[in-house]
Interface confidence: medium
């Protein structure tokens, strides 16, 4: 349990301490106060090291101290002989004594006081980001006009979220442009237009100074564009480092702007635009486009149709052509809908014959139809090869669409016959 | 057959098996079976196997029975009331249209039919083979298949054979030119129960092949001269007969 | 006049394995079927296998099946069984014999004993 | 398989009987059958094949007669020469089988 003071004697006193003694003693005073630690009295047997017998002061895994002979005070006016001061609310006092003594020593006597600590200046690390405040057993922070203290009661930043951009065209700033931005916040904007328009960013690189990176390469204060799961940046430093016209593919853009304690720059101002969704020219394979154009944007509309020896199967039903919407989601609509080969199926088996597993039933696929040799053989000819045509069937350069005949090889025994010798 | 060889169904796979009457066939394509007509003109719905070198019941089970649609003999061929007192056998041929189409392979592959050009006209000398399970020196009927080569020979040859078992005057059994006479060499003959077996001539035109240039029809005495059915002599009533009578998918 | 002679018998470990030869003569040997055939001591006969002419058709017992093998070499008139994994049980005289007439087995040879013992 | 049934599986007759071994077929084996002779210390030896049909050399004292599941093989007239192990043996499905064999003595 903490308590507010102590006293500390070695074993006996003030009679002579006993051979082969090893004590310990552990302090603790409330949190938020230091301990203030000192000797009255102190008659240890003396030795190099202090290693015969010796008391040693530890706080955490640092030895403070530790001692051994007789000590007396510098200053008539106080008794204390040695004393320390932590500014931890724990401490570790061990008394050894080892096997023989040549005099008789009377050991040691010590007392504890709780001590107020300054969190705002005793440390190396500040505590507060802006002001810090202290009071017997802590401190709190505080934060100056326009700023709020974050949820870990250390940071104070500026409240600067929440705005929505919906309008077609604008502007956006971090917080006191051109003056430098807040220190320690995070400010995150929304731009939210009509579906079917993609936000398109447009900078100046000369609208940009934000704190640069690290050694490391990692931004300290930095600019982010998020637009579903695509991410542009972070950025930062002097002068904008990405493109200058960043096209989000989408109607909703998140803007972070994240800075740390340090380093305030004049931040940042950029434009926005919503722009017709543009869906890709693609490169759809074995069709033609109608109208051909150099660029498609929301709402247009286009007709596939197939090149020779290809079909769109949509369901079960083979067509030609199909049409396709430019959506506002920057997709083509019917894009599942491909020019695919035509697809002959499976060839139809025969009698007495097989037909290898085609590696591929499309158009322009070749496969080969085999008798069951040695006992059947191809009677119609054509030598079996057939072709995928454009009409899904399967063709053969003599017989067309009609399938090889495996008829019987005749009066050939498998085995010639040896007849009896006489 | 007599004065023959063991032999196995791979050195045959054309031969069929009737078991009644105990008799030969010939295999000449997947709905077909060729035969001599007086095989079948006594039961026209006869049981057929291929496939097997051995006719035991066991070994039988185990292979390929083959069932027929129709039996088509010969016009020519003329019915008696009395066949055992038979003396002409001209005309000695029929076709078995079967059922279902057979499935080829090592034991089971038809024979050809002969070429209509001369090439297909035989020479005394020439050698054929012939097979089955009929009498053999030993026994009424062989148990395993067995066969033996023997020369074409001239006509007269069988007629000068005296007939064992007579069943009407010498002079009163036919010779034509529809019937080839072979054997007379080391006691080599076809038997009863070999009728209907193919006499199998290596194709001049092809001799990795053989074709069926007779059928074992009748003999005045076993061991001596036999006479084959001369298939080439019927070749044009086989196709019609064929063709008449086949599926569209045959066709 | 036809002899089978048999050889390649003797005292084997179990597990282990023997071949052994048929020396055929006094007939073309091409043109028959051959059998094996054994004997245990003091039992009666027991066909353990059948080889074709050409040597395209065996059939084996069930209780050697898998472990022996039938073989022919008609250039050299002989006939060979192979035994492999042997066991106590396979202990007989074995005896190779012609296959004549549909299956009866016309001539026999002396007969050659194996032992299977550890 | 086909199971062959011989009996008695030993007899003892005096010279010039009439000697009766009977073998029965677990199955119709038609007369896919075969009766063999072994003397002591030697190799069997083919005596009549097909139930009933005599091999060539062999003395007509030895008959045999029988079909379907049933066969008897018959010596008409008991010689001392004849003292051996008789056994049938089927030949209508692989695997050949054996009868167990009849010992016939002389008293």
């Known amino acids: 349990e903490p308590t507010m003071y102590g006293e500390i004697l070695s074993p006996n006193y003030p009679q002579a301490y006993p051979s082969e003694v090893e004590k310990s003693w552990d302090i603790e005073v409330p949190e938020g106060y230091g301990i203030h630690l000192y000797f009255t009295h102190l008659d240890i047997e003396l030795s190099e090291n202090c290693a015969y017998d010796s008391v040693q002061i530890i706080s955490g895994d640092t030895e403070e101290g530790r001692l051994c002979g007789q000590r007396s005070s510098n200053n008539p006016h106080s008794p204390i002989v040695e004393e320390f001061q932590v500014p931890y609310n724990k401490l570790q006092v061990i008394f050894k004594s080892d096997f023989s003594n040549e005099e008789r020593f009377t050991g040691f006597a010590a007392y504890y006081v709780a001590t107020d600590i300054n969190e705002c200046t005793d440390f190396v690390d500040v505590p507060c980001s802006h002001f810090c405040n202290n009071f017997i057993g802590g401190y709190f922070c505080s934060c100056p006009p326009e700023y709020f203290l974050h949820d870990d009661m250390k940071n104070c930043g500026v409240n600067c979220s929440g705005d929505v951009f919906t309008a077609l065209i604008g502007e956006i700033a971090s917080p006191n442009y051109p003056k430098p931005y807040p220190e320690n916040s995070r400010c995150e904007y929304q731009i939210r237009l009509e579906k079917g328009f993609q936000v398109v960013v447009t900078l100046r690189r000369e609208d940009f100074d934000v704190e640069a990176a690290d050694s490391a390469g990692n931004c300290l204060d930095s600019l982010v564009f998020v637009a579903g799961d695509r991410q542009f940046g972070p950025y930062c430093g002097h002068g904008f480092p990405g493109p200058l016209n960043i096209e989000t593919k989408s109607n909703a853009l998140d803007i972070i702007f994240q800075t740390d304690l340090t380093g305030q720059k004049k931040g940042w101002k950029l434009r926005y635009h919503g722009d017709p969704m543009p869906c890709p020219k693609e490169d759809t394979p074995n069709s033609v486009w109608e109208p051909a154009k150099a660029k498609y944007v929301f709402r247009d509309v286009v007709q596939i149709t197939c090149l020779d020896g290809f079909e769109v199967v949509e369901g079960r039903v083979g067509a030609t052509s199909f049409y396709s919407t430019c959506q506002s989601n920057g997709k083509w609509s019917n894009s599942k809908l491909k020019c695919q080969p035509v697809d002959c199926g499976i060839p139809e088996s025969i009698e007495n014959g097989k037909v290898e597993d085609p590696e591929s039933t499309l158009f322009g696929s070749v496969i080969r139809y085999t008798c069951e040799e040695p006992y059947y053989y191809m009677e119609n000819g054509g030598g079996g090869e057939y072709h995928c045509a454009g009409n899904g069937s399967w063709v053969n350069e003599v017989l067309g669409p009609e399938l090889p005949k495996c008829v019987p090889v005749c009066g050939v025994p498998r085995e010639p016959f040896e007849e009896k010798q006489r | 057959i007599i004065g023959g060889s063991d032999a196995d169904i791979k050195n045959f796979p054309w031969q069929v098996f009737f078991d009644n009457p105990w008799a030969g066939g010939a295999l000449i394509n997947e709905y077909w079976v060729l035969t001599a007509a007086h095989v079948v003109e006594g039961n026209r719905e006869p049981t057929m196997y291929v496939g097997s070198t051995s006719v035991q019941t066991s070994r039988l089970a185990k292979s390929k029975m083959l069932t027929p649609e129709h039996v088509f003999i010969h016009p020519g061929w003329k019915l008696l009331e009395v066949p055992e007192g038979r003396t002409n056998f001209d005309n000695d041929i029929a076709l078995v249209r079967l059922k279902d189409p057979v499935k080829m392979g090592p034991t089971v592959s038809p024979i050809c039919l002969p070429g209509t050009s001369s090439d297909y006209n035989l020479m005394d000398g020439d050698l054929g083979l012939i097979s089955g399970w009929g009498r053999t020196e030993k026994r009424d009927r062989a148990v395993r298949l067995k066969a033996a080569r023997l020369p074409v020979a001239p006509l007269r040859k069988c007629k000068e054979v005296k007939v064992e078992k007579p069943t009407a005057d010498a002079e009163a059994y036919v010779f034509t030119p529809n019937m080839i006479c072979a054997g007379g060499e080391k006691g080599m003959d076809s038997c009863k129960g070999d009728s209907g077996g193919a006499f199998a001539v290596q194709d001049p035109n092809d001799k990795t092949k053989f074709y069926a240039a007779g059928l074992v029809s009748w003999g005045p005495q076993c061991g001596t001269y036999g006479l084959y059915t001369r298939v080439k002599n019927y070749v044009d009533w086989i196709m019609k007969t064929m063709q008449e009578n086949s599926t569209p998918r045959e066709d | 006049q036809v002899q089978l002679v048999e050889s390649g018998g003797g005292l084997v470990k179990p597990g282990g394995s023997l071949r052994l030869s048929c020396a055929a003569s006094g007939f073309t040997f091409s043109d028959y079927y051959m059998s094996w055939i054994r004997q245990a001591p003091g039992k009666g006969l027991e066909w353990v296998s059948y080889i074709s002419r050409s040597g395209s058709t065996k059939y084996y017992a069930d209780s050697v099946k898998g472990r022996f093998t039938i073989s022919r070499d008609n250039a050299k008139n002989s006939l060979y069984l192979q035994m492999n994994s042997l066991r106590a049980e396979d202990t007989a005289v074995y005896y190779c014999?012609?296959?004549?007439?549909?299956?009866?087995?016309?001539?026999w040879g002396q007969g050659t004993l194996v032992t299977v013992s550890s | 398989d086909i199971q062959m049934t011989q009996s008695p599986s030993s007899l003892s007759a005096s010279v010039g009987d009439r000697v009766t071994i009977t073998c029965q077929a677990s199955q119709d084996i038609s007369n896919y059958l075969n009766w063999y002779q072994q003397k002591p210390g030697k190799a069997p030896k083919l005596l009549i094949y097909?139930?009933?049909n005599l091999e060539t050399g062999v003395p007509s004292r030895f008959s045999g007669s029988g079909s379907g599941t049933d066969f008897t093989f018959t010596i008409s007239s008991l010689q001392p020469e004849d003292i051996a192990t008789y056994y049938c043996?089927?030949?209508?499905?692989?695997?050949?089988?054996f009868g167990g064999g009849t010992k016939v003595e002389i008293k």
């Open positions: 043996e089927q030949y209508e499905d692989y695997p050949l089988t």
């Open positions: 014999a012609r296959d004549q007439e549909d299956y009866a087995l016309d001539y």
């Open positions: 097909d139930a009933s």
